[in-house]
């Protein structure tokens, strides 16, 4: 389609005459406000179709949209249409008139809408106001469409100034139908019960006045109906509750319980389901693995945690070396068992600033009248290594010895290293590791002892140096899982008179 002039926006003089032409490969027609105004249609020798719309004695009321579309009963593939918007600035026309339908805007949800107040002159400044207020609202204006935005359930007017007079539009009314969607919540006093105990479920709806409840449950499927009770919890907003109560539950009552709520006015519905388990007798089950050997670091706090499932709620006891533990008044031990869901529990033993004496055999026992479970582990207290002694001696044999003694838990490893260039070591030159069996110039002898009372290992290592011809820095490093410690000593040759 080809439109002359092409637009898409034209500003024409009042009282003037103007010609619009549209041409295309099939019959074309001009449309204005869903009507076909009088126009001249023609077909050229080259097969081109055209339509000429002559606008005479233009007034502000001619302001608006004009469309050129194909007018072909053969139904061309294309839905092509060309839009042109014409302004005819006319001081005698304030706002363009609206149909009644355009003055009342009806909504069921929060969505962007347009308040279609339009003027004849694109240069005019137009503002939007609540009908009862003078303050202009910060809403974007399009001269071809009006004010677009999200509007509250109020009445609005548009204002503009033409010359020196202020002009008001008709009032526009926004009606929002507050359709309260149904929101159902279902909960049970307990989702796990033993046979013979009661099942009680509640289905609650908020904000609706007239609703219908329908329950489905395992007993219903076998034809054994239970009559629910419905009550109002609060007046505003409406809280309506349906209670389904099944006394003396049986194993067959296990399954899905569904509450379906409908309200007929707007045909809304919602449903929620909950699973109920009826067990023959109570249970206690450990969840997850706890290693049989646990570690704690000396003087640090350590929490040991056991997770388990149980119904009904169990009694939990902790033991150390078969003696019952309790919260100590000095705050050195803290015991807690908390319910993290209806049937899941976490029991924690916290040792504050761990001492060596707290190493030992620990047991947690959870039990009730139907079942019990216990879990045991050995607690090892890890002690960072300390080098307690590093000494050098000159036995008569002529060799020189360096003795290193240290303690820690778990057993420390010992690393000997030496540095020959005292000026550059250890910053520039890495120390040489000693004690490798292939080297003849040094020999290593290491003894390890476990001290039961202190519950730690002692390492004593002796390094024998065959011939020391210049001063040597010898370093002893002890390392274990929780730390390391180093000491060094300068070893000088026999020939030097000083130490």
């Amino acid at each position: 389609l080809v439109v002359t002039p092409p637009g898409p926006e034209l500003v024409l003089n009042v009282s003037s005459t103007f010609v619009l032409t549209c041409s295309g490969s099939a019959p074309v027609v001009w449309e204005r406000m869903s009507q076909e105004p009088p126009q001249e249609m023609a077909k050229a020798q080259d097969g081109t179709f055209s339509s000429v719309l002559t606008l005479t004695n233009l007034t502000g009321l001619d302001t608006g949209e004009y469309f050129c579309t194909h007018n072909d009963s053969r139904g061309l593939e294309t839905d092509e249409r060309k839009r042109l918007y014409i302004f005819v600035p006319d001081p005698t026309v304030g706002f363009l008139p609206n149909d009644a339908e355009e003055l009342f805007i009806f909504l069921t949800e929060i969505t962007e809408i347009t308040i279609p107040c339009r003027v004849t002159d694109p240069q005019l400044v137009v503002t939007l106001h609540e009908k009862k207020g003078d303050v202009a609202l910060p809403v974007p204006y399009d001269h071809q469409r009006g004010f677009s935005g999200i509007f509250e359930d109020r009445s609005y007017i548009c204002k503009t100034t033409i010359g020196d007079r202020e002009v008001d539009s008709d009032a526009y009314y926004v009606y929002r139908l507050q359709v309260s969607s149904i929101n159902v919540s279902v909960n049970a006093v307990q989702t796990v019960v033993r046979q013979g105990e009661n099942i009680t479920l509640m289905c609650i709806v908020i904000g609706n006045e007239v609703v219908n409840f329908e329950w489905t449950y395992p007993r219903k499927e076998s034809g054994r109906l239970v009559e629910p009770v419905t009550d109002f919890l609060l007046d505003m907003p409406y809280h309506i509750r349906s209670i389904l109560h099944i006394p003396s539950a049986e194993l067959e009552d296990s399954g899905t319980y569904t509450c379906n709520v409908t309200e007929s006015v707007n045909d809304h519905q919602d449903e929620k389901a909950i699973n109920i388990t009826v067990v023959e007798s109570g249970y206690v089950r450990l969840l997850g693995e706890v290693g049989t050997l646990q570690f704690a670091e000396l003087h640090r706090s350590r929490t040991l945690q056991v997770v388990f499932e149980a119904y009904p709620p169990p009694t939990v006891l902790w033991f150390k070396d078969n003696r019952t533990l309790g919260d100590s008044s000095a705050g050195e031990i803290a015991l807690s068992t908390r319910n993290v869901s209806e049937t899941r529990y976490v029991s924690e033993l916290t040792l504050v600033r761990v001492k060596v004496a707290e190493a030992g055999h620990y047991t947690m026992r959870a039990f009730h009248e139907d079942a019990e479970v216990q879990l045991s582990f050995q607690l090892q207290i890890n002690v960072p290594v300390r080098v307690l002694e590093l000494s050098e001696s000159h036995p008569d044999s002529g060799e020189q010895t360096v003795r290193c003694r240290g303690r820690g838990m778990p057993q420390p490893n010992i690393i000997w290293s030496a540095c020959r260039d005292l000026k550059r070591c250890p910053r520039e030159l890495p120390p040489t590791l000693l004690g490798n069996s292939s080297e003849e110039e040094s020999q290593l002898e290491t003894n390890v002892t476990y001290w039961e009372e202190e519950q730690e290992f002692e390492v004593v290592s002796t390094l024998r140096l065959q011939h020391v011809d210049r001063p040597l820095s010898v370093r002893c490093t002890l390392r274990n899982a929780v730390g390391q410690d180093t000491q060094e000593v300068i070893v000088v040759p026999h020939s030097l008179p000083f130490k």
């Epitope: 009908k131 009862k132 009445s155 009606y175």
Partner: nanobody
């Protein structure tokens, strides 16, 4: 507080007519139109028409012109909307609504079902 209470659901055969009432209480009868709107399930609200409180001024949606009439009983404060020559596509929930300037007020809706 304005309250609008509508008549109950109706089931009609094609070609019949239906008259829906809307009783208004707490309503200032002089300053606001009573609107009638309908909603086919799953579709947008469609304007049906309006009448003024005294019942001497009505405007109908062009689509329904000639098939709809709106009247008012000022003594009881009841508005009526009557739709004639019912068709299956007239099946909808019909609402009356009015505007207080700072908010709108709605009836609870009346379901009209047209079915042979």
């Amino acid at each position: 507080q304005v309250q609008l209470v509508q008549s109950g659901a109706e089931v009609k055969k094609p070609g019949a007519s239906v008259k829906v009432s809307c009783r208004a209480s707490g309503y200032t009868f002089t300053n606001s139109f009573m609107q009638w709107v309908r909603q086919v399930p799953g579709q947008r609200l469609e304007w049906v028409g309006l009448s003024n409180p005294s019942g001497d001024y009505t405007v109908y949606a062009p689509k329904l012109q000639g098939r709809v009439t709106m009247t008012t009983d000022t003594a009881t404060g009841t508005f009526y909307m009557e739709l004639f020559s019912l068709r299956s596509d007239d099946t909808a929930v019909y609402y009356c609504a009015t505007h207080g300037g700072d908010r709108s007020y709605w009836g609870q809706g009346t379901l009209v079902t047209v079915s042979s």
